[in-house]
């Protein structure tokens, strides 16, 4: 129950005071009482409800004619049951009593008064009256939790704005609103009782810039909403008319979890005694509510694909037609973006990760926006953001950051659970150098510190700075699966592919060419691949950095090797010892649920069917996966990338409300 | 081929900042590795600092790491070298140089470490 | 104090031939094979001769020629001509914090 104030009883006159339903206020009757009085009796209107306890240990009574010692161990508390009609109509009379004096009586009027700040705490979707059932001042994690949740107004329902909503203190229609939280303030009280009090709302100086609220006039359209705290207003005057009344506000969340913010805002109702002209207000009561700010959540290649995104560059329309092809397949929808808007910029993984924030009552996909700031910088602002589809971004937007601030670098696993550890939404995968040096990249501090506020995906951070672009992407993806843990961990493997190709030498094919009908493109036959030294050396470097990961994969998101298919590649060695893909890198896929567009690897043709597709074909197909080898050479291949880095993908938010989770 | 052409160089006071800019013409640039390189007057070449074709690593000597920074802008055909903090010992000419990367060979690596083009240089003077 | 070592200066008379040598350490001359020269003459940009210890890019006399012997990497000028008066540099690739690495260059006479 909610704790209420201190009231002091006088024998010289009346008291007056407030009492708000569902506190629990104590009552000093020692302080004032005669100086000869050894014991007193308490009688009540029957609207107020007294409890006497004497300890320790503390027995509790209700009131009766009973009589109390008057010592500091009695403890008196009220209650009321109900609201007051007018003023000071519930009375508590203090009768004293002395060996020699006839008794002397304090008298205490009582004014009843229902204030409550309501929230979804439940978080069922809809604010229901909680008066003293829950303790609204914490927020608590899983399925037995309670809080309720604000989600960051990081879309634009206005088109016509280039802003975010929660950048301006304005709303601009419901659907504006149905971005924000409901809050609900009810009072009862007696008509005339804000001649002598008023109600204040307020947050935290250190909060008020991360949160805006709005009060609404009920019954009225939503263009009467009147911003009433946020970052410019820390607290506000309630003007609320006595009686019976209930007032909404709607709340949207300015800010992400971060390093500096861990998401939590509270905002508090306070009534303040303004009776007394020469004196300052004095706090009456207070009521607060906790609000966590919704995480932004990453999604899997596992979750169902709805919306594909790519390029268009000068010579990439076969590329297209087979991401369209696959999109059609998978029932999606497809966003291409114009040569005149990416500005010759074809990598739309590193341009953004597009993942959703959630509220009960409310789910908003929401892309975030890397720093790498490249042709496609304006895509993600410009024509993703817009109604109901959010924005947010971290990091320098000028310079300071490396390759490994690309999103082709940060990845999801799908659901796992680790030594009995359930990460019902994944674990984040980036990509980071071993140890620091004076030339290894990392992502940006910025970003992973985003990254891990967020609460609810635990990063791990893999081991990336090897390969020449530096991108997770380029050696591991996930694909579903009917079995075991629902999907499958593929690994690019040089050992695999080695294995395969001395096979083939085995059986007669060691003239078979790799590149064949690439035009402008050397042919290499296998029996030169699997002779050249300094290719086999480069591998076996590729192979223990590849394995270093897998170790740490399996560690950190619980899986056995028969959660893991190595998909056969090779690598080169570049300048510098960075590594990057010798012939089309398989394992940079599109994952469409059961569709793959996969880089057509152009290996070895052997009986009439190359022999890298045949082998990935053999190892995917038992899984229900249907595999589609894409031409991506010479518009992707030869500039560093595949057909994964050329593309994006919106995909199903969880089944799973991240609430319930406990990180 | 590509022909390269520094510009931006001039005279700064210590502690300034210089942006040099190297464009490419003949050939697209995002096909090369660039360094930019220099040599202060009457004294050796020294080189300054590396950029891949891809753009997705950097690499700086000892004497201007944390000063200097490289970047390209491959739309433009040009690549950079932002110089802050400027010292009395950075005066120089500034050569900026490439290598192809489109090699064909099973493993051929190497061509970042070496320059095949150069441009005619600009001079940095810095001077108070 | 450069990191690679050179003679401050060679010479020779035309049609004979001569070794500028380029010592370094077992962190970048005795470990890579990324060693290159170039040749610069007065108020010129410098011009590659040799890379990878001893390849010639095209339109590079063969008169040109590179070695590598343990932690030395040399270059060769064979049939001296006056134009080839220059001043010459090498360079490695090194494991060092810094990358790559020159000589401080040898004068070339053609006496």
């Known amino acids: 129950m909610a704790q209420g104030t201190l009231i002091r009883v006088t024998p010289e006159q009346p008291t007056h005071a407030v009492c708000v339903l569902g506190t629990l206020t104590q009552l000093d009757i020692c302080s004032s009482a005669p100086e000869d009085c050894t014991s007193f009796s308490i009688n009540a209107s029957p609207g107020v409800v007294v409890d006497i306890a004497h300890g320790p240990p503390a027995k509790k009574k209700s009131t009766g004619s009973s009589t109390w010692p008057l010592d500091p161990g009695v403890e008196v508390t009220l209650t009321m049951k109900v609201a007051s009609g007018s003023t000071g109509d519930q009375k508590v009379q203090i009768s004293y009593y002395g060996p020699k004096t006839p008794p002397v009586k304090a008298l205490l009027y009582l004014t009843g008064v229902e204030i409550s700040l309501c929230a979804d705490i439940t978080r069922t979707g809809k604010v229901k009256p909680t008066r003293a059932v829950k303790d609204q001042r914490t927020w608590t994690w899983g399925p037995c939790g309670q809080g309720a949740i604000l989600l960051v107004n990081c879309d634009r329902d206005n088109l016509e704005s280039s802003a975010m909503d929660c950048e301006d203190d304005e709303v601009l229609d419901s659907e504006d609103l149905q971005d924000m939280s409901l809050m609900t303030l009810s009072t009862k009280t007696p008509k005339d009782f804000f001649t002598n009090h008023t109600l204040v709302l307020h947050v935290a100086r250190s909060e008020m810039d991360k949160v805006r609220v709005f009060q609404a006039t009920r019954g009225k359209l939503s263009s009467k909403c009147s911003v009433v705290l946020g970052p410019k207003w820390p607290s506000h005057y309630l003007m609320v008319p006595g009686g019976k009344h209930n007032m909404d506000f709607y709340v949207e969340a300015l800010a992400f979890p971060d390093t500096d913010f861990p998401g939590l805002i509270t905002l508090t109702i306070s009534l303040l005694d303004t009776s007394n002209l020469e004196l300052p207000e004095a706090v009456v009561f207070q009521d607060s509510v906790v609000f966590r700010v919704a995480p932004w959540i990453m999604t899997p290649n596992t979750q169902p694909p709805q919306e594909v995104y790519a390029c268009s560059i000068f010579e990439n329309e076969d590329f297209l037609k087979s991401v369209t092809t696959l999109a059609m397949k998978a029932k999606c929808k497809l966003t291409i973006c114009p040569e005149e808007e990416n500005m010759d910029d074809q990598w739309m993984q590193d341009e953004m990760e597009i993942g959703y924030i959630q509220a009960p009552h409310k789910t908003l996909p929401v892309v975030f926006d890397s720093p790498r700031n490249r042709g496609l910088k304006e895509f993600p602002i410009k024509r993703v953001m817009g109604p109901d589809f959010g924005y947010v971004t971290r990091g320098p937007q000028t310079g300071g950051i490396s390759g490994l601030d690309s999103f082709g670098n940060l990845e999801v696993s799908p659901p796992v659970t680790v030594r009995g550890k359930e990460y019902p939404l994944g674990r984040i995968l980036f990509g980071d150098s071993c140890y620091p040096s004076n030339d290894s990249r990392q992502m940006h501090q910025a970003l992973q510190d985003f990254l891990s506020a967020q609460q609810v995906q635990a990063p791990v951070k893999l081991y990336s700075d090897w390969l020449s672009v530096g991108h997770v992407d380029e050696f591991l993806s996930f694909v579903p699966a009917p079995d075991r843990k629902g999907f499958r961990l593929l690994l690019a493997s040089p050992r695999s592919c080695y294995k395969l190709f001395q096979e083939q030498q085995n059986e007669g094919h060691g003239e078979a060419l790799l590149f064949e009908g690439i035009k402008k493109k050397k042919q290499q036959k296998i029996k030169n691949i699997l002779s050249n030294k300094t290719l086999r050396e480069h591998n076996s470097f590729v192979e223990r950095c590849i394995d270093w990961n897998r170790e740490l994969l399996k560690r950190e998101l619980g899986l056995a090797e028969s959660d893991i298919i190595d998909i056969p590649q090779l690598f080169k060695l570049k300048e510098f010892s960075k590594a990057e893909a010798f012939f089309p890198n398989m394992v940079n896929m599109l994952v469409l649920g059961k569709h793959l567009g996969i880089p057509k690897p152009f290996g070895p043709v052997i009986n009439g069917r190359c022999c890298l597709e045949e082998k990935v074909c053999s190892l995917l197909e038992p899984l229900g996966l249907q595999c589609t080898f894409i031409n991506d050479f010479f518009t992707y291949h030869i500039r560093h990338g595949e057909v994964h880095c050329g593309t994006n993908v919106r995909r199903k938010p969880f089944s799973f409300k991240w609430w319930n989770m406990v990180p | 081929q590509v022909q390269l052409v520094e510009s931006g160089g001039g005279l700064v006071k210590p502690g300034g900042s210089l942006r040099l800019s190297c464009a490419a013409s003949g050939s697209t640039l995002s096909d090369y590795f660039v360094s930019w390189i220099r040599q202060a007057p009457g004294k050796g070449l020294e080189w300054v600092s590396f950029?891949?074709?891809?753009?997705?690593?950097?690499y700086y000597a000892d004497s201007v790491r944390g000063r200097f920074t490289i970047s390209r802008d491959n739309a433009k055909n040009s690549v950079y070298l932002q110089m802050n903090s400027l010292r009395a010992e950075d005066t120089a000419v500034y050569y900026c140089?490439?290598?192809?990367?489109?090699?064909?060979?099973?493993?051929?690596?190497?061509?970042?470490?070496?320059?095949?083009?150069w441009g005619r240089g600009t001079l940095v003077t810095v001077s108070s | 104090q450069s990191a690679l070592t050179q003679p401050r200066s060679v010479s020779g008379s035309p049609g004979q031939s001569v070794t500028i040598s380029c010592t370094g350490t077992?962190?970048?001359?005795?470990?890579?094979?990324?060693v290159s020269w170039y040749q610069q003459h007065p108020g010129k940009a410098p011009k590659l001769i040799i890379y990878?210890?001893?390849e010639r890019p095209s339109g590079v006399p063969d008169r040109f020629s590179g070695s590598k012997s343990g932690n030395t990497a040399s270059l060769t000028i064979s049939g001296l001509q006056a134009e080839d008066e220059a001043d010459y540099y090498c360079?490695?690739?090194?494991?060092?914090?810094?990358?790559?690495?020159f000589g401080g260059g040898t004068k070339l006479t053609v006496l």
């Open positions: 140089s490439s290598a192809n990367d489109d090699v064909d060979d099973i493993v051929a690596p190497g061509r970042g470490y070496y320059m095949d083009v």
């Open positions: 077992s962190g970048d001359v005795g470990r890579y094979s990324h």
């Open positions: 360079s490695s690739h090194s494991r060092s914090s810094t990358p790559v690495l």
């Open positions: 990878n210890v001893y």
């Open positions: 950029i891949n074709s891809a753009n997705t690593f950097t």
